[in-house]
Interface confidence: medium
């Protein structure tokens, strides 16, 4: 056996909706061989599941095996390194990974102009992986709500509209003109999950878009 | 009619903070957009913050840069300015002012649209 190699520090879960990352911190001096065994478990089914033998990045996307993450009681997931025949002891995630770990993310958010109001539009995330019936508004039915930060560009300010309970928001500009820059932070009432703000989507506002009214 | 009455100022060394007060009176305080504006000496009056009458929406100057937080108390007719991380510039008269309307809109960092001041308090950031 030789000297047993040391265990991976930390294995933890970054996920998004449908996006279900098990990141690791690489063990000390690991060698060009070293590899990482990836074991999954599903909460209710006490069995450890090899996913992945010999894995040499620092991350595995589990996407595809914790499908159903949002309709059970979720998942443990181990690692351990593997070099040669020698391998380390399993390091398993502190927590439990399940819906309340998903970092809510909004998929884009569109604006318009009229009539001298700004008109966003959130867009839910759509992702590839997700089965036909599993939407974010079927998963996340009630009290989705969203974070709004609005600048100006060039301006003296920025502002954020801390609750829209929907997915529509409005925002009238008071004669204001120039560019309005928008970004969107998702969270359910009800739930304790973060959220992530949406990169910032910009519209321009001159003159043309006021209409005059007697 | 709102009367508005703020407090908190003092002097305070750079990085510290500082919490202003503003106690309104009158019975409509809770339906009124209110917020804190400042004027530095020899200079024109600047926007700080506003927080609509339901505390939904806060609106900041660029220079605040989060060191800021506003929020108020319905329930005890007064308003809150959160100061961290301050600076020799943010030495100024603070005032607290309220406005009318409640529509999620850009009127509230303007000056004008603010029909209710208070007499200010003195904040003076200095080593």
């Known amino acids: 056996h030789g000297t047993e190699l040391p265990s991976p520090p930390s294995v933890w879960f970054e996920a998004e909706f449908f996006h279900h990352i098990l990141h690791w911190t690489p063990i000390p001096n690991q060698s060009e061989s070293t590899c990482y065994e990836v074991a999954l478990l599903r909460y209710g089914i006490e069995s450890w599941n090899s996913i992945s033998n010999c894995s040499q990045t620092l991350s595995y996307d589990l996407t595809a095996v914790t499908l159903d993450l949002y309709h059970s009681n979720g998942y443990r997931a181990r690692v351990r390194a593997v070099d040669g025949s020698r391998h380390s002891n399993w390091t398993v995630t502190n927590t439990r990974f399940s819906v309340d770990e998903v970092t809510l993310t909004v998929g884009s958010v569109n604006l318009e102009i009229h009539n001298g109001f700004i008109l966003g539009k959130i867009q839910l995330p759509r992702p590839k992986m997700a089965p036909a019936n599993d939407t974010y508004e079927s998963i996340f039915s009630h009290f989705r709500e969203y974070e709004i930060a609005i600048r100006k560009v060039p301006g003296n300010f920025t502002f954020t509209h801390k609750k829209v309970k929907h997915e529509n928001f409005s925002l009238l500009t008071s004669g204001e003109v120039g560019e309005f820059c928008v970004q969107v932070k998702p969270s359910v009432a009800s739930r304790s999950n973060k959220g992530m703000w949406s990169k910032e989507e910009c519209i321009s506002l001159t003159r043309q878009y006021f209409t005059v009214t007697n | 009619e709102v009367q508005l009455l703020e407090s908190g100022g003092g002097l305070v060394q750079p990085g510290g903070s500082l919490r202003l007060s503003c106690a309104a009176s009158g019975r409509t305080f809770s339906s009124h957009t209110v917020g804190w504006f400042r004027q530095a000496p020899g200079k024109g009056r600047e926007f700080v913050a506003a927080?609509?009458?339901?505390?939904?929406?806060?609106y900041f100057g660029d220079f605040v840069e989060g060191r800021f937080t506003i929020s108020r108390d319905n329930s005890k007719n007064t308003l809150y300015l959160q100061m961290n991380s301050l600076r020799a510039e943010d030495t100024a008269v603070y005032y607290c002012a309220a406005a009318t309307g409640q529509v999620w809109s850009l009127q509230y960092l303007r000056e004008s649209s603010y029909a209710y001041w208070g007499q200010g308090t003195l904040v003076t950031v200095s080593s």
């Open positions: 927080i609509t009458w339901n505390g939904d929406t806060t």
